[in-house]
């Protein structure tokens, strides 16, 4: 009878154990073991007994005693177990960006480890385990699904092997992967609010305001404002799931034109973006020319006004004749228009608006000098010790210079209040005198004695 | 579609004048702005001039300031460089391009025309 | 500066993902504009914006920014793609109104 010891072993791959071989006979004519495994016999007495080492064991393996005694052949076999950790346990890589409310596929990869029978795959969460699957195939994989939620944010993910020979008398060995950290967001699928100026002038400042709600992480959430290729530098503000982007934009003369302003959301693996036109526009005010802008009385004057060549444009309330960016009109110069303001009135459609621009210009008209009757009357009679005040209004422009004088020396003093006295009687020569000439007139004040009862 | 078509090009003596034409059509030329960039026969792109879609603000290269002038006539849909005091290293095809806005990208462009300065 | 520097040349093989880049300090201001040109032919625009196409342009033709650094990638590079690539850009230094890189000659092999 042959018997074999130990008869059931398990090793780690590429160990070593030694197998004892013994027959009930004391004589055996053949006493041995068949093993395809590297195999080395140690030396003891007796005949009935022999001890191999069997080295570099790599996969499991029943080693078979023989023995050959006069009353037959018998055999023994002794079972190898060897046992070996996972070589790879891998997360299949992801995005690490994933929206809230997607599934989430985990995938996890284990190759090799022995015995399979006491290999198990576990998914975690954290410490959770969301699976555990015993290692079936090679590779083995074991999957499940998550929805995302938004306190997964942050959360990290991974795949652990466990090796349990705790039966075996052996320990339990685990392996864990890389770990996979999930980054979750959401981004609305309403696109980014924009206010902006629909229109702005050349050499002007405007402001562009972008904002959206509803986003998580909020403080993940990059903002690219660009007005045409121009990039714009907001001063974001962030709210709890909300933020608002703020940028100054200055346009030039490089900019006229239609450009489109963009605002981008970009979170996690998603973008949002919103367009919108802006007519960047040049509209200097209108022109206003007069032939001169100082003339004398009963001169010819024109007045035009030009303005930007897809302007209409009114002259003191005219339109121009045809409608469009010129008119003019012609006046003789009067007194009357000495002050008188032309003002052109611009209106240039861009991008649906009507922008207004306005231009005035004063005519002055140089005239006089003059002395009516209405403002220099030429009598006056008052009754002696009244008070008065003689009153000689001259027109002209420039405004002349007046002096009443009698006999050439005595003045009456214009707009100043006297007592009236015989000395103030008699007739007086008013001059008044300009740049535009001289007038005299004569004024005669009268005095009239009181009458004594 | 759109189209820009240049015309005028030629050879010309080292001191003399040219204008370049483009005719523009499928589009609405006044609300575009219009460029010229010229290319020396084997060389790369330089931009020379661009003008607003109204007429009322042009831009020149330092190379050619003072002696190109970029010009349109929105009612004939045509853009123009008249160039004058040429110069050897004015040699090169010009191309007109149109653009939103005065200083933005070219969305189109003509097949160009051969400028030869030499004497 | 109003300098764009490209490399003059880039050699790709057929189907393989090629990144052409341009850099300038006014990159930091302005987005690039990227044109393509066929030898004996006009320029014609293919990337504008941050990334924006215009109609017509495959979309293996796009574009990226960082910095003062442009780049236009062609991801599946088709030997119709052989040609002249310029960048563009607006001039921060003032002294032009818009500046073009010196251009790269894109090779397909194969």
């Known amino acids: 009878q042959t018997s074999v010891s130990p008869s059931k072993v398990i090793l780690p791959r590429g160990g070593s154990v030694l197998v004892t071989c013994s027959t009930s006979c004391d004589q055996p004519k053949l006493l041995g073991i068949e093993t395809p495994l590297p195999k080395k016999e140690l030396l003891l007495p007796g005949n009935n007994r022999k001890v191999y080492e069997l080295s570099n064991v790599q996969e499991d393996s029943q080693p078979m005693c023989y023995s050959n005694c006069p009353d037959g052949q018998s055999t023994a076999k002794t079972f190898l177990t060897v046992y070996w950790t996972p070589e790879r346990v891998e997360l299949a890589p992801l995005p690490s960006w994933q929206p809230v409310g997607k599934n989430l596929t985990l995938r996890c990869q284990v190759e090799g480890g022995a015995p399979r029978a006491n290999l198990t795959v576990v998914l975690l969460r954290g410490e959770k385990e969301l699976k555990r699957e015993p290692a079936v195939g090679e590779p083995a994989e074991v999957t499940t699904t998550v929805l995302v939620r938004r306190d997964h944010h942050g959360a990290n993910f991974s795949c652990r092997t466990e090796l349990d020979l705790r039966p075996q008398g052996l320990e339990l060995f685990e392996n864990t992967s890389a770990p996979y950290q999930l980054q979750t967001f959401v981004l609305p699928a309403t696109p980014p609010q924009l206010v902006s100026p629909r229109v702005l002038e050349v050499d002007t400042q405007g402001t562009v305001v972008c904002s959206l709600d509803g986003l998580f992480p909020v403080s993940e959430a990059q903002v690219h404002l660009a007005l045409g290729d121009q990039r714009l530098n907001p001063t974001v503000t962030y709210g709890n799931d909300s933020f608002s982007a703020k940028a100054s934009v200055s346009v030039t003369a490089e900019d006229e034109g239609t450009q489109r302003l963009t605002c981008a959301v970009i979170l996690g693996n998603q973008s949002q973006e919103t367009l919108q036109t802006v007519t960047i526009y040049s509209f200097p005010a209108p022109n206003v020319i007069l032939t001169k802008p100082e003339v004398s009385e009963g001169t010819e004057v024109t007045v035009k006004c030009e303005a930007h060549p897809r302007a209409k444009v009114t002259l003191n309330g005219v339109p121009a004749q045809p409608l469009g960016p010129r008119a003019q009109l012609l006046l003789k110069a009067t007194p009357e228009d000495n002050g008188r303001s032309f003002s052109c009135s611009a209106t240039l459609e861009v991008a649906g608006q009507l922008i207004h621009k306005n231009q005035t210009r004063e005519l002055r008209v140089l005239y006089g000098p003059r002395l009516d009757e209405r403002d220099c009357p030429g009598n006056w009679t008052w009754p002696e010790n009244s008070q008065q005040t003689p009153m000689c209004q001259a027109w002209g422009n420039p405004l002349p210079e007046l002096k009443c004088l009698k006999d050439g020396t005595f003045p009456l003093p214009i707009g100043e209040s006297v007592t009236v006295t015989r000395d103030l009687e008699g007739t007086y020569l008013c001059r008044a005198r300009s740049t535009q000439g001289e007038v005299t007139r004569k004024v005669t004040v009268n005095v009239l004695s009181p009458r004594y009862e | 579609q759109v189209q820009l078509v240049e015309s005028g090009g030629g050879l010309v003596q080292p001191g003399g004048s040219l204008r370049l034409s483009c005719a523009a059509s499928?589009?609405?030329?006044?609300?575009?702005?219009m460029s010229w960039v010229r290319q020396a026969p084997g060389k790369g792109l330089e931009w020379v001039s661009a003008?607003?879609?109204?007429?009322?603000?042009?831009h020149c290269a330092d190379s050619v300031k003072g002696r190109f002038t970029i010009s349109r006539d929105n009612s004939k849909n045509t853009l123009y460089l008249q160039m004058s005091s040429l110069r050897a290293e004015d040699t090169a095809f010009y191309y007109c391009?149109?653009?939103?806005?005065?200083?933005?990208?070219?969305?189109?462009w003509g097949h160009g025309t051969l400028v030869t300065v030499s004497s | 500066s109003s300098e764009l520097t490209q490399d003059p040349a880039v050699s790709v093989a057929l189907g393989q993902t090629v990144k052409i880049t341009c850099q300038g300090d006014?990159?930091?201001?302005?987005?690039a504009s990227w044109y393509q040109q066929r030898p004996g032919q006009a320029p014609v625009l293919v990337i504008y914006?941050?990334?924006s196409r215009p109609s017509g342009i495959p979309d293996r033709f796009s574009g990226s920014s960082s910095g003062n650094t442009a780049s236009l990638t062609i991801t599946g590079a088709q030997a119709e793609d052989e040609a002249d690539y310029y960048c563009?850009?607006?001039?921060?230094?003032?002294?032009?109104?818009?500046?073009f890189g010196g251009g790269t000659k894109l090779t397909v092999l194969g």
């Open positions: 914006g941050e990334n």
């Open positions: 003008i607003s879609g109204s007429g009322g603000s042009t």
């Open positions: 563009n850009s607006r001039d921060s230094s003032g002294n032009h109104l818009r500046v």
């Open positions: 006014s990159l930091r201001t302005y987005y």
């Open positions: 499928g589009f609405t030329f006044s609300s575009y702005a």
């Open positions: 391009a149109n653009s939103a806005y005065t200083g933005g990208w070219y969305d189109y």
